[in-house]
Amino acid sequence: TQNKALPENVKYGIVLDAGSSHTSLYIYKWPAEKENDTGVVHQVEECRVKGPGISKFVQKVNEIGIYLTDCMERAREVIPRSQHQETPVYLGATAGMRLLRMESEELADRVLDVVERSLSNYPFDFQGARIITGQEEGAYGWITINYLLGKFSQKTRWFSIVPYETNNQETFGALDLGGASTQVTFVPQNQTIESPDNALQFRLYGKDYNVYTHSFLCYGKDQALWQKLAKDIQVASNEILRDPCFHPGYKKVVNVSDLYKTPCTKRFEMTLPFQQFEIQGIGNYQQCHQSILELFNTSYCPYSQCAFNGIFLPPLQGDFGAFSAFYFVMKFLNLTSEKVSQEKVTEMMKKFCAQPWEEIKTSYAGVKEKYLSEYCFSGTYILSLLLQGYHFTADSWEHIHFIGKIQGSDAGWTLGYMLNLTNMIPAEQPLSTPLSHSTYV
């Protein structure tokens, strides 16, 4: 008789990341009997929902169910039917919805209400949809990357199983860049965290962590651009804005109403003598960099040290994983290699931004123009944010690792969120049970 394989004793979890520009659904899988082990949960699927972020559905709220259908049906296919009822589903909304809530709590609630009703119709164990705080977004991103890097494991290994892993158990800091906010999270070296709002205390696998985190709302790459435009149009002499952050020859007409519809530009709002203006790219990295720096108020700091806008930031410590848009933008620009120095990155950005728009379109014919036009600004913004905003230097640049995935799982807040909500990160180190780990014979 043939040996029949025993049914896999596995569990699944689903997290939807409702970001400012789009929604992604992640499916995670882990062995049921190793729930409390570190590093056993891994991503088996990512499904990007077609369409914009949920905050854009205020005028079409009843379509949210349809919007989520394809990815939820994909989850139904990937996860065995016998597991559906015990598979938790979580949706976390980030800065796009934080901004909508600032404009109208009622509209934000209505969007979330429809999301909840839609997700409740599936055979999974729906656990709720909510707007997560910036502090949570930072913390869960930090948990995700350190969990995947094996930093919470108490077993020291003589070999490395994951990239960037050194034998020490020092955690990595987390740098997350979205469309509407950016987060910085790390364990400072023996430094008191001077502002309570930025302090987190964790006990994970028997070890205490004092973590610094801050989320800068309106400083994601998309909202930062709108801020910059709103700032620059104030001093424009007419409806032409010559912009160094776009390639020479690039032109784009912008509606003033679009510029002022986000709360992020409120501080720059003024009555303009025109309804539209035209951006004309001049492609100058240095001038673009200077313009971006004007978004960071560094003149005021009530602490021993600040990032910008009066926000406390301790001295940087250790290695950092930079993910989400930090990674996507730098990957496009071919600047994610560990060997590329900060000076080289700056040099490459200068060359890239100076390339004529027609030339860029030819070189990257397969890329949608709406995305292609953004990389000069986004790359320059990343450099400005990391160097002037967070005080990385040419020397400490080598401690930044641009990370897309670790061991096949996306770097981001979703895995940490699920690990926390399913109580899969114990406070104490679990006792090893016989044969729960592979043994050498």
Epitope: S20, S21, H22, V49, K50, G51, P52, G53, K56, F57, Q59, K60, E63, I66, Y67, T69, D70, E73, R74, G96, G179, A180, K221, D222, Q223, L225, W226, K252, V254, K368, K370, S373, E374
Partner: nanobody, 124 residues
Framework: QVQLVESGGGLVQPGGSLRLSCAAS????????MGWYRQAPGKERELVAA???????NLADSTKGRFTISRDNTKNTVYLQMNSLKPEDTAVYYC??????????????????WGQGTQVTVSS
């Protein structure tokens, strides 16, 4: 931009059938879903049926079991097959398509396109 052209409306007796068509042209790669809405005199516009880019369908409770929505990708056309029609199905039927706005920039906006509408009258 996306252009939507509807056809197939008309007068039909109760219990009869009609098939509406909606042909899409333009930058359709960004479309996430297409569907049909209807508006009866003095009433609000309501969703009848929708089909996603992945082929999943969604029908209003009032039309389940009677109406079906389908699409032909080669013709970029969506169909609404309406059977067992009732007088209360009388309305102007509008084709709708929505998705990512390709002209939006630094943050994705929702694009929302509508056809001109086609009259469906169910009467004996």
């Amino acid at each position: 931009q996306v252009q939507l052209v509807e056809s197939g409306g008309g007068l039909v007796q109760p219990g009869g059938s009609l098939r509406l068509s909606c042909a899409a042209s333009g930058s359709i790669s960004s479309i996430a879903a297409m569907g049909w809405y209807r508006q009866a005199p003095g009433k609000e516009r309501e969703l009848v049926a929708a089909i996603t880019s992945g082929g999943n369908t969604n029908l209003a409770d009032s039309t389940k079991g009677r109406f079906t929505i389908s699409r032909d990708n080669t013709k970029n056309t969506v169909y609404l097959q309406m059977n067992s029609l009732k007088p209360e199905d009388t309305a102007v039927y509008y084709c709708n398509a929505w998705g990512e706005d390709d002209s939006s920039w630094f943050g994705t906006d929702l694009c929302d396109y509508w056809g001109q509408g086609t009259q469906v009258t169910v009467s004996s």
